[in-house]
């Protein structure tokens, strides 16, 4: 607790002080006072530099004195033998004695009192910037007229802050300009313009004279401009050292003028104005700016249009252009949007074809579709090459965005039929010789696959079973073989409207229009053992002549068995219709004259006993295409016959091509279109 006075005595005083003692006293008087310390008695062992015994007086880090020996007063009216005056309110006194004393020393007696200090004169650093007023225990500062005392209660300055300039144009000068500016002042000016305008400051060199920098280059008085996180300055010296035109890129500017106690000059004067905030003419690749201008400023709007093949992707939506506005902060709106190459995406897969995984799916990339050859070909042309177009679609030169269609190749067997192992009336065949051959198990019959969804057969095969089970791809009709082959499920049976339905089909004598179509539920996958036969063309090239050869195949009756286990086939010539009429019906169900012969029928056979028979019905009479020798077309369908091993009658398919096409078109699925 600070005291105004006090007494300090060495140990045992006035007796001799003991050896090996170290004692200290911390003196503290109230703040605003100094300390007057005086000794009235001093009797301490004398040594050089008071090394043995001593009394030490310390103020802060400074040793004010170190005493030893004997002292007596020089003034008979005063008991003081030694005194110290310090302008601080704290003092430390330390007494030390060593291990021995040659004589008996009595030590010291000292007293301290608090004394007033004159803060205005007693210190090197003047506490007040202008006027200093001392009083007992303290001081206060005061200012000349028109100055005010700052919050620190020491510095005076002029009241030059708080001005806010909002006009788009204006002039600001230092206080008293062009007379000397006040010392020890901090002047702050604020320019606050409407958003979207930047403050532009202009100065003339001659309008600036501020106390120059010190030898280290630090401005003693300074002018600083602060715009957001950007600072211009500090500036000082004779003549403005900075740019005469300062574009702040901000609508808010703080001007700070700081002066010290010395060296007042005339100061400075500046002009400012608000410029609409400029936005940079950015280089946005793959795009065009509309309108094109040398400079864009606040509130300007441009339309940025992507070049062909480029698009703006925002979220999941692609657009070809976007608008951008020069904003109040000097930045363009939508600046994140970029014109990127159009991405056509992973190309769609196609049925019975493939597309190689593209290296790139971006604008300009090229892909190629191919069909699963040799079983499928590209029906709608175009070569299968597509490029990624500017609209984001894969486009073909011929088809545009329409995908290629892989359709089955018709009439081409994987292996040609050769009559190698002769069997009476025909040969063993492999399904690869007749990949269009369809097996019907109830009734036991045949049919011809004409495309993925359709089987052509005789009307009499399906008239009694409108849900036939069919199989493709197997040479043998043994159960274990059929279990491994492809079973076809019918969706609908279409019998030719000209086919007469009878109460008792067994007694039929009229086989005119013996043709039917079976629509399948699912498309058939083509391959070496399953592939369609072509339909005849409508031109006269497809009119059969007597002697023209055709191939028949099936699992019908043979000389040995009612039903063949493995596919049999024969090559037969076309014969005149009369040849069929002349053959006596084997097991007639009516008079021979009752049997109907029409131009819708083809007569064939008669050679070496080769003929179709019961169980072959509905199978194709395949003839080489006159316009493409590599292909076969279904010239006829096994229909009926007077006697197995003679001549047989076949439905003339050419006469039904229009009905076939119309039926298929009217009953196609969207997938097939």
């Amino acid at each position: 607790e600070p005291t105004m006075y006090g007494e300090i005595l060495s140990p045992n005083y006035p007796q001799a002080y003991p050896s090996e003692v170290e004692k200290s006293w911390d003196i503290e008087v109230p703040e605003g006072y100094g300390i007057h310390l005086y000794f009235t008695h001093l009797d301490i062992e004398l040594s050089e530099n008071c090394a043995y015994d001593s009394v030490q007086i310390i103020s802060g880090d400074t040793e004010e004195g170190r005493l030893c020996g004997q002292r007596s007063s020089n003034n008979p009216h005063s008991p003081i033998v030694e005194e110290f005056q310090v302008p601080y309110n704290k003092l430390q006194v330390i007494f030390k004695s060593d291990f021995s004393n040659e004589e008996r020393f009595t030590g010291f007696a000292a007293y301290y009192v608090a004394t007033d200090i004159n803060e205005c004169t007693d210190f090197v650093d003047v506490p007040c910037s202008h006027f200093c007023n001392n009083f007992i225990g303290g001081y206060f500062c005061s200012c000349p007229p028109e100055y005010f005392l700052h919050d620190d209660m020491k510095n005076c300055g002029v009241n030059c802050s708080g001005d806010v300039f909002t006009a788009l144009i204006g002039e600001i000068a230092s206080p008293n300009y062009p007379k000397p500016y006040p010392e020890n002042s901090r002047c702050e000016y604020q320019i606050r313009l409407e958003k979207g305008f930047q403050v532009v400051v202009t100065l003339r060199r001659e309008d600036f004279d501020v106390e120059a920098a010190d030898s280290a280059g630090n401005c003693l008085d300074s002018l600083v401009f602060v715009a957001g996180d950007r600072q211009f300055g500090p500036y000082c010296g004779h003549g403005f050292p900075g740019p005469l035109n300062i574009e702040t890129k901000s609508n808010a500017l703080d001007i700070i003028f700081q002066t010290d106690l010395t060296g007042q000059k005339k100061g400075w004067k500046l002009r400012y104005h608000g410029d609409p905030m400029p936005c940079p003419k950015e280089d946005t690749p793959n795009s065009v700016w509309e309108p094109a201008k040398a400079k864009y400023v606040f509130r300007d709007v441009v339309q940025i249009t992507c070049l062909d093949g480029f698009e703006v992707v925002e979220g999941r939506v692609g657009a070809t252009s976007f608008y951008s506005t020069c904003q109040s902060n000097g930045k363009w709106s939508n600046s994140k949007l970029k014109c990127q190459p159009v991405d056509c995406g992973i190309p769609e897969s196609i049925e019975n074809g493939k597309v190689e995984d593209p290296e790139s799916t971006l604008f300009g990339s090229v892909i190629r579709y191919t069909c699963e050859e040799p079983y499928y070909y590209m029906e709608n042309g175009g070569g299968g090459e597509y490029h990624c177009a500017g609209n984001g679609s894969w486009v073909n030169e011929v088809l545009g965005p329409e995908l290629p269609k892989c359709v089955p190749v018709c009439g081409v067997p994987r292996e040609p039929f050769e009559e190698k192992q002769r069997i009476i009336g025909g040969s063993d065949a492999d399904i690869k010789n007749f990949p269009w051959q369809v097996f019907f198990d109830n009734p036991w019959a045949g049919g011809a696959l004409i495309n993925e969804y359709w089987v052509l057969t005789a009307a009499h095969v399906v008239e009694g079973n409108r849900e036939p089970t069919m199989y493709v791809g197997s040479t043998s009709v043994q159960t274990s073989r059929l279990a491994k082959s492809k079973m076809l499920t019918p969706e609908h049976v279409f019998i030719h409207p000209g086919w007469k339905l009878l109460e008792v089909p067994e007694g039929r004598t009229n086989f005119d229009n013996d043709i039917a179509l079976v629509r399948l539920k699912d498309p058939v996958k083509m391959g070496p053992t399953v592939s369609p036969i072509c339909l005849p063309g409508t031109s006269s090239d497809y009119n059969l002549m007597d002697g023209d050869l055709g191939l028949i195949s099936g699992w019908g009756r043979t000389e040995k068995r009612d039903r063949a286990v493995r596919l049999k086939a024969a090559r037969l010539p076309v014969a005149p219709l009369r040849k069929c009429k002349e053959v006596k019906v084997e097991k007639p169900t009516a008079d021979a004259e009752a049997y109907v012969f029409t131009p819708n029928m083809i007569c064939a056979g008669g050679e070496k006993g080769m003929d179709s028979c019961k169980g072959d019905s509905g199978g194709a009479f395949a003839v080489q295409d006159p316009n493409d020798k590599t292909k076969f077309y279904a010239a006829g369908l096994v229909s009926w016959g007077p006697q197995c091993g003679t001549y047989g009658l076949y439905t003339r398919v050419k006469n039904y091509v229009d009905w076939i096409m119309k039926t298929m078109q009217e009953n196609s699925t969207p997938r097939e279109d």
């Epitope: 097996f439 009709v477 159960t479 279990a483 079973m487 040995k560 068995r561 286990v565």
Partner: antibody, heavy 119, light 107 residues
């Protein structure tokens, strides 16, 4: 109609082999697929295997793999089934059966051959 | 190999009853399933093939249904001649395995 005539009953000792024959008449063996089925007394039917003429390979039930051999002599239209390393549980009636067509599994059955394995 | 599980193993019924026998395949066999009837000392007789097709000469009281893995044989009205053992057989895979059989006996 195909007829299948099998060889007569056999009595064999454990560890021995038995060869059962099956003669086809009314058709040729080349046109047929022959299967073999057995039935132990009071037990169920067990399919043993078949010769697949299309693939030219014999397919055996897992249970008999390594012990059974099925062969055919097309010149005499006779099929054979040989079972080796016989054990008492092989005592059964062994049938040869022709495979049917168009979804019918078995067409014609032989009269059966009783093989008795006893020490 | 595909396993065939037939149930029940024994079934007691009276003449005129409707009888159902179930056969379950361990994996799909499409419709490649047959049903046989066997009487003691005789070779099995085919009743149903391709799951639901009735073999010629078999009375219409026998019917089959199902596809994939679940199949049933139904005798709509049991006759005295129908007391026998019935077997299912799959013939989809190379191994044409039989079920273990269901004996239909007089109640």
């Amino acid at each position: 109609q195909v007829q299948l005539v099998q060889s007569g009953a056999e009595v064999k000792k454990p560890g021995a082999s038995v060869k059962v024959s099956c003669k086809v008449s009314g058709d040729t063996l080349t046109e047929l697929s022959m299967h073999w089925v057995r039935q132990a007394p009071g037990k169920g039917l067990e399919w043993m295997g078949t010769f697949d003429p299309e693939e030219g390979e014999t397919i055996y039930a897992q249970k008999f793999q390594g012990r059974v051999t099925m062969t055919e002599d097309t010149s005499t239209d006779t099929a054979y089934m040989e079972l080796s390393y016989l054990r008492s549980e092989d005592t059964a009636v062994y049938y040869c059966v022709t495979e049917g067509l168009a979804g019918i599994p078995f067409d014609s059955w032989g009269q059966g051959t009783l093989v008795t394995v006893s020490s | 190999d595909i396993q065939m599980t037939q149930s029940p193993s024994t079934l007691s019924a009276s003449v005129g009853d409707r009888v159902t026998i179930t056969c379950r395949a361990s994996q799909s066999i499409s419709s490649w399933l047959a049903w046989y009837q066997q009487k003691p000392g005789k070779a099995p007789k085919l009743l149903i093939y391709k799951a639901s097709s009735l073999e010629s000469g078999v009375p219409s009281r026998f019917s089959g249904s199902g596809s994939g893995t679940e199949f049933t044989l139904t005798i709509s009205s049991l006759q005295p001649d129908d007391f026998a053992t019935y077997y299912c057989q799959q013939y989809n895979s190379p191994s044409w395995l039989f079920g273990q059989g269901t004996k239909v006996e007089i109640k």
